[in-house]
């Protein structure tokens, strides 16, 4: 589809006369009629197959022909045609003289034509005109012509339809040729996919409009290349959606149990060294000089007693020092200058001779040690309480003093909180990581449901026949004041009355 | 060849969200070259189209009944649905999808038999 | 809103031309489609990309689309081409369809 237009520019007939040398009276009043059809070697009447148009009275003999695409489109005249353009044709300009105002060609006597021209060839469709000028021996016609397609036809031969879009069956305009030209954004065949914005993940993500990243589910972050793990993952991640694959030290379905309390607390002080023992569980092995279940007491070198045979210990910045009793002497009063004419062994201690009487040693009694049974058996000087245990010495044997929420001879073992059945009046326990909590039942309150809140016992209107209820408080139970003509706890029995 | 078949409840009450599913065959919902509509026939009365889902999950929708309309699309079992939410008696209709061709402009070059939808206490 | 102006009928007699004509502000850079209802039946498409015909329509349709204006023609209209007829274009994303036609062929 597309329009033949032909531009008229000039007209000549000085002599103002008909094509048949007779003058026009009082002026050839000239106007045009155009025939535009098929290639014709040799152009002959017939049928205009590619389309007629006329124009009004243009001027009188001679005349330039203004442009005028204003007025009803007269020139460039337009010939349109609704097919493919064949590249060639013929065209046949009359001019005509119109002595009145009837323009018909029935309403004209056949000698008013001035001229006919004829021209064939070959013709391309563009925006560029070709110029031609027409003599004959009165006249001159000059004028120019092209083809050019209809709106939103395109190509060679203006065959191609093609209408710019911009909605989602695509966001194009067309090219010259027809073929269309994606707006800025979009691809595809028809310009309807956009161009997600650039690392976009091909798989997880997409986009309906472009330079955006909508992530498909299961999949986040700004390229929809970060999966989701399963919802409440704490110390976990995942390689595809909706896993929680642990992180070390980690543990259970949400990856939130603390298998390493080691590393994530340090709760061991003083340089000791942690053992992982389960989970959130840990053991503190302390170096020498320190004590406690986090290693976080100090020993004084002289608690382990270094100093033997009753010699006393000094602390001293760099360690001890022992004042040795007469008769001993060495780095811990190891050394005995005494015999067993000396009576060295107390606590009831026997003496024997050694080295034929250089040397001696005491046979301590139960309870009693030291190279002179001067000391109390310590049986604490190990340390055996574990998880911050008191170690105390009972005789001739030792006990461990646990710590709140543990049990056991060395206070190994870790006892619930609900055990000593704390919660008052019936509460019920439930342990706490870091305590416990009571569940109270109705009438009581507080931490341990030990404060007693009143209940209104008469909430429940147990008295009948209108009797009034009154709350002890004391006991909360109801007392019902009945009215005349009825007893019982509730008033609800009736006496007969006289 | 082609086919589209509507299935869904053929009464919904005043106020209920009306739910039709669109199950393809013969054809794969994810191409690229369609996207998948659905459009209404009051009896006696026009087409209205309601709106239209790309495999990809991109929808549009009727502006006037934008608020009330979700589609959406299951690439896995090959069928993309409608629900109209707080429906009334206007709602009642017979309601087709069909499959609207890029190549051919948008045209609906494939329709469902279309199943009625009366709307009623 | 956009909207398509059809004639509610249109009445012709069997071997003649129908023309059935569809009206939308600027519809000639729109592509309008053409569909066919017969009663209880789907439609079907018989035009679309304004004068394009999908395989299995007749000749006898054809279409235009310039200006405001957009036409179904069908030549050598025949009895069983009674039916409704509905224009259709896309204004942005939305769908757009004409109210009908009714042809009668006497």
């Known amino acids: 589809s597309g329009v033949f237009q032909l531009q008229l520019q000039e007209f000549i007939n000085e002599r103002g006369v008909l094509a048949s040398g007779r003058p026009c009276e009082p002026g050839c009043r000239t106007f045009f009629r155009v025939c535009l059809k098929h290639f014709q070697a040799v152009v002959s009447p017939g049928p205009c197959t590619f389309g007629t148009v006329s124009t009004p009275v243009l001027g009188t003999n001679s005349f330039a022909v203004r442009d005028d695409s204003s007025g009803g489109g007269r020139n460039p005249l337009q010939l349109p045609f609704n097919f493919t353009w064949p590249g060639t044709f013929s065209l046949i300009i009359e001019a005509w003289h119109a002595p009145g105002d009837d323009l018909r060609p029935e309403a004209l006597p056949p000698d008013a034509l001035i001229s006919k021209i004829a021209i064939q060839g070959s013709l391309a469709v563009g925006q560029n005109w070709l110029l031609d000028e027409q003599t004959s021996t009165l006249t001159r016609l000059r004028y120019s012509y092209r083809v050019i397609c209809s709106d939103n036809y395109y190509g060679d031969n203006c065959s191609r339809l093609c209408k710019k879009r911009n909605d989602h069956f695509g966001h194009y305009v067309c090219q010259p040729d027809g073929n269309l030209s994606c707006l800025p954004g979009w691809t595809g065949e028809y310009c309807q996919q956009p161009i997600c914005l650039s690392g976009c993940h091909e798989q997880n993500g997409y986009c309906s409009k472009p330079a955006e990243c909508l992530c498909r589910p299961g999949w986040q972050g700004r390229l929809c290349n970060e999966c989701i793990p399963h919802n409440g993952c704490r110390h976990g991640t995942c390689s595809t959606p909706w896993q929680c694959t642990c992180d070390e030290g980690w543990g259970g379905l949400f990856c939130d149990q603390d298998l390493n309390y080691c590393t994530h607390h340090s709760p061991c002080k003083n340089g000791a060294t942690c053992s992982n023992s389960g989970q959130r569980s840990y053991t503190c092995t302390c170096r020498p000089g320190y004590t406690g279940v986090d290693c976080e007491l100090e020993l004084s070198e002289c608690d382990s007693n270094p100093c033997r045979n009753g010699g006393s210990c000094k602390d001293q910045e760099d360690g001890y020092h022992c004042l040795c009793p007469p008769g001993y002497y060495g780095l811990h009063c190891e050394h005995s200058t005494l015999s067993c004419a000396d009576s060295p062994c107390f606590n009831g201690g026997s003496c024997r001779e050694r080295n034929q009487g250089a040397n001696y040693a005491c046979e301590c009694p139960p309870n009693f040690t030291g190279s002179n049974c001067e000391k109390k058996v310590d049986r604490c000087t190990s340390n055996p309480c574990a998880n911050g245990g008191q170690c105390l010495n009972r005789g001739p044997s030792r006990m461990c003093r646990c710590r709140p929420g543990f049990t056991g001879t060395y206070c190994e073992l870790h006892v619930s909180d609900c055990a000593r059945n704390p919660c008052a009046h019936g509460g019920t326990c439930h342990d706490l990581e870091n305590g416990l909590m009571c569940t109270c039942p109705a009438g009581f309150s507080g931490r341990r449901c030990e404060v007693r809140t009143s209940i209104d016992a008469c909430a429940s209107s147990p008295c009948f026949n209108r009797a009034t209820c009154y709350t002890d408080l004391s006991t909360d139970t109801f007392v019902c004041n009945c009215p005349y003509g009825f007893v019982g706890s509730r008033c609800e029995f009736p006496v007969g009355l006289p | 060849e082609v086919q589209l078949q509507e299935s869904g409840p053929g009464l919904v009450k005043p106020s209920e969200t009306l739910s039709l599913t669109c199950t393809v065959s013969?054809?794969?919902?994810?191409?690229?070259?369609?996207?998948w509509g659905w459009i209404r026939q009051p009896p006696g009365k026009g087409l209205e189209w309601i709106g239209d889902i790309y495999y990809t999950g991109s929808t549009y929708y009727n502006p006037s009944l934008k608020s009330r309309v979700t589609i959406s699309v299951d690439t896995s079992k090959n069928q993309f649905s409608l629900k109209l939410s707080s429906v009334t008696a206007a709602d009642t209709a017979v309601y087709y999808c069909?499959?609207?061709?890029?190549?051919?402009?948008?045209?609906?070059?494939?329709w469902g038999q279309g199943t009625l939808v009366t709307v009623s206490s | 809103s956009y909207e398509l102006t059809q004639p509610p009928s249109v009445s012709v007699s069997p071997g003649q031309t129908a023309s059935i004509t569809c009206s939308g502000q600027r519809l000639g850079d729109k592509y309008a489609s053409w569909y066919q209802q017969k009663p209880g039946q789907s439609p079907v498409l018989v035009i679309y990309e304004d004068s394009k015909r999908p395989s299995g329509i007749p000749e006898r349709f054809s279409g235009s689309n310039s200006g405001d204006t957009a036409t179904l023609t069908i030549s050598g209209t025949q009895p069983m081409d009674e039916a409704d007829y509905y224009c259709?274009?896309?204004?942005?994303?939305?769908?757009?369809f004409g109210g009908g036609t009714k042809l009668t062929v006497l």
């Open positions: 069909a499959r609207q061709a890029l190549a051919m402009g948008g045209g609906s070059d494939k």
């Open positions: 259709q274009a896309w204004d942005r994303d939305t769908g757009v």
């Open positions: 013969g054809g794969s919902i994810s191409s690229s070259s369609y996207y």
